[in-house]
Interface confidence: medium
């Protein structure tokens, strides 16, 4: 919206002549039309797009014309519009002869024409005034104009419309461009956001003046940085309200269970190192020389037959020691000091010479084994055994010793810790390769569902306005998290609009 | 008044006598029309002949002209084309102020471009 | 350049009402003015004013015709149509020099 504005300056007519060169009689009592529309390569006709105005009569042939009101007219004339200023226009100013009072086009005679100028061109919004003069045959027109905004606008083209306030619609005044410049302590578009106190966290807290910080649900402190812990959580802490993370060696819903089971039940024997591994559960790294869960059982070194041609083998506390036979020596038995004369191939294994007949090598037949031919073939040499059993030689056959969780002749079956229903109120058991896992039904928890938990309050969706719930497990109850701009136990109201200021 | 068989590259000049309104109040133009086409404008001048204007495709070789005195509008066409035929009105070209919705075209003259 | 389409020909039955449309190919409409003219042109005399911006009746024109649009389409009305209504219907714009004229609409008795 804005206001084009034309001061009509001098205007001459010497002979007093009309545009027909008819003289005027006794003068030419001279008013103004002026028609302004949109721009035109060629001004032709059709209406005055953007306004017309006419004078009265402000002079008789030749006169100057005054800046203020003239015999009821206004100088400079108003032609006021209500669009954006295209920047460019087409201008027509007539001077025309008023024989009497009536100055309607059909009261006047049709040659009453003085003068018609017509000028175009690009005109931008601004304060200073163009001066133009247009000169006829007869008639001379000097001239000024320019386009400004009306009140309230701003802006190249005056589309800006801006009026300051300070209210809960906004807390601004306007910059000349037509932008608007918040009042301090406001943001936003409209400047109706408040500025929180410095440092008030963006998410947590919020607030309805400036300079202020108003925690959501679930989070304290002078900032609203500091999140609260689920309500008696008693060795634990949290990084999002209602939570309760457990400090090291403590479990359950509420951080209240030991889970440092080696410290309080020293379950490991033998000097082996105790591992904590979850709620009653732990870990034995035993000493070499021993095995089993506990580290309980002792193992023989002698076991894995170390002593080589017939020696036997004698365990000690620190290891054990090869009793070799007659002929051999060394840790293990391994050196001979008998040659081929000396028939040392046992079960009909066949002699040979080595090194000049230093040295011997025992050919063994089928089912034997050893430097001398001296051993059965140990059928677990090939680890039959799956999942970790225990290969034992017995006479002619073997069989293998299964670890727990495992049966069959290899120990290939795995049995099913699932079998025995280990999961409590109705939970569904899998078997996994090291143990079996519970899944249990709403409202219970635990490794075996054994714990019974709240319902969870949130799954009826009950906070508004995109906020966030979560449930409170020692009430059965929800807390819903705000987002900015709503209050309420269930985020239904809008945050309460600041009081409005007089301007 | 002026129309007629022409050659191309010739020249021919067209006159409009108007009657019956001040002529020297109202802008004028020259509009032609052919069967193929159709109307076209092709001319304007200023109520006081300071200002004229053309379609691009005449330019430079017509002039638009006027004598308030005689209340007369011209045509003056040179180097004449084929495309030139066509019949040509004279209208006045106003409406500011003076009653809008009233125009006076000329009955039309036939101009016709031909070896 | 505006330009301004019209279908060729209508085939009207006298006493009926007769709709002719012209659609332009920019907006003709400016300050909430309609810059369109509607013509008549009876075969071998010049074309005679009929509406001017959109819906203004000319002067000494029947009732019968009307106009109305806005923008880019328009559409002159003759409602009943006689016998001396059998013409050439042009629309012309005035929104932007060089004026333009539609391609023209024929008139004819079914």
């Known amino acids: 919206s804005g206001v084009f504005q034309l001061q009509l300056q001098e205007f001459i007519n010497e002979r007093g002549v009309l545009a027909s060169g008819r003289p005027c009689e006794p003068g030419c009592r001279t008013f103004f039309r002026v028609c302004l529309k949109h721009f035109q390569a060629v001004v032709s006709p059709g209406p005055c797009t953007f306004g017309t105005v006419s004078t009265p009569v402000l002079g008789t042939n030749s006169f100057a014309v005054r800046d203020d009101s003239s015999g009821g007219g206004r100088n400079p004339l108003q032609l006021p519009f209500n669009f954006t200023w295209p920047g460019t226009f087409s201008l027509i100013i007539e001077a025309w002869h008023a024989p009497g009072d009536d100055l309607r086009p059909e009261a006047l005679p049709p040659d009453a024409l003085i003068s018609k100028i017509a000028i175009q061109g690009s005109l931008a919004v601004g304060q200073n005034w163009l001066l133009d003069e247009q000169t006829s045959t007869l008639t001379r027109l000097r001239y000024s104009y320019r386009v400004i905004c009306s009140d309230n606008y701003y802006g190249d083209n005056c589309s800006r419309l801006c009026k300051k306030r300070n209210d809960h619609f906004g807390h601004y005044v306007c910059q000349p461009d037509g932008n608007l410049s918040c009042l301090p302590g406001w943001t936003g578009e409209y400047c109706q956001q408040p500025i929180c106190l410095s440092g008030c966290h963006e998410q947590n807290g919020y607030c309805s003046k400036p300079a202020e910080c108003l925690c959501r649900p679930g989070w304290q402190g002078r900032l609203c940085n500091e999140c609260i812990p689920h309500n008696g959580c008693r060795h634990g802490t949290c990084s999002t309200p209602w939570q309760c993370t457990c400090d090291e060696g403590w479990g359950g819903l509420f951080c209240d269970q030991d889970l440092n089971y080696c410290t309080h039940h020293s379950p490991c024997k033998n000097g082996a190192t105790c591992s904590n591994s979850g709620q009653r559960s732990y870990t034995c790294t035993c000493r070499p020389g021993y095995t089993g869960v506990d580290c309980e059982l002792e193992l023989s070194e002698c076991d894995s037959n170390p002593c080589r041609n017939g020696g036997s083998c004698k365990d000690q506390e620190d290891g054990y020691h090869c009793l070799c036979p007659p002929g051999y020596y060394g840790l293990h038995c391994e050196h001979s000091t008998l040659s081929c004369a000396d028939s040392p191939c046992f079960n009909g294994g066949s002699c040979r010479e080595r090194n000049q007949g230093a040295n011997y090598a025992c050919e063994c037949p089928p089912n034997f084994t050893g430097s001398n031919c001296e051993k059965k073939v140990d059928r677990c040499t090939s680890n039959p055994c799956a999942n970790g059993g225990q290969c034992l030689n017995r006479g002619p056959s073997r069989m293998c010793r299964c670890r727990p969780g495992f049966t069959g002749t290899y120990c290939e079956l795995h049995v099913s810790d699932c079998a025995r229903n280990p999961c409590a109120h109705g939970g569904t058991c899998h078997d996994l390769e090291n143990g079996l896992m519970c899944t249990c039904p709403a409202g219970f928890s635990g490794r075996r569902c054994e714990v019974r938990t709240s319902i969870d309050a949130c799954a009826s969706s009950p906070c508004f306005n995109r906020a966030t719930c979560y449930t409170d497990l020692s009430t059965d109850t929800f807390v819903c998290n705000c987002p900015y701009g709503f209050v309420g136990s269930r985020c239904e109201f809008p945050v309460g609009l600041p009081p409005s200021f007089p301007w | 008044s002026g129309g007629g068989l022409v050659q191309p590259g010739r020249s021919m000049k067209l006159s409009c006598a108007a009657s019956?309104?001040?002529?020297?109040?109202?802008?004028m133009a020259w509009v032609r029309q052919d069967p193929k086409k159709g109307l076209e404008w092709v001319a304007t001048?200023?109520?006081?002949?300071?200002?004229?204007y053309y379609r691009d495709s005449v330019k430079g070789r017509f002039t638009i002209s006027r004598d308030n005195a005689k209340s007369t509008l011209y045509l003056q066409m040179d180097s004449l084309r084929s495309e030139d035929t066509a019949t040509y009105y004279c209208?006045?070209?106003?409406?500011?102020?003076?009653?809008?919705?009233?125009?006076?075209w000329g009955q039309g003259i036939s101009v016709t471009v031909s070896s | 350049d505006i330009v301004l389409t019209q279908s060729p020909a209508l085939a009207v039955t006298l006493g009926q009402r007769a709709t002719i449309s012209c659609r332009a190919s920019?907006?003709?409409?400016?300050?909430?003015?309609?810059?369109m003219q509607w013509y008549q042109q009876r075969p071998g005399r010049q074309p005679k004013l009929l509406i001017y911006?959109?819906?203004n009746l000319a002067s000494g024109i029947p009732a019968r015709f009307s106009g109305s649009g806005s923008g880019t389409d328009f559409t002159l009305t003759i409602d009943p149509v006689q016998a001396d209504d059998i013409a050439t219907y042009y629309c012309?714009?005035?929104?932007?020099?060089?004026?333009?004229f539609g391609g023209g609409t024929k008139l004819e008795l079914r």
């Open positions: 209208k006045d070209y106003d409406g500011h102020y003076h009653p809008y919705g009233m125009e006076a």
């Open positions: 019956g309104f001040t002529f020297s109040n109202y802008d």
């Open positions: 001048i200023s109520y006081d002949g300071r200002s004229t």
């Open positions: 920019q907006s003709v409409t400016i300050s909430n003015y309609n810059l």
């Open positions: 911006d959109a819906s």
């Open positions: 012309q714009q005035s929104r932007d020099d060089p004026r333009t």
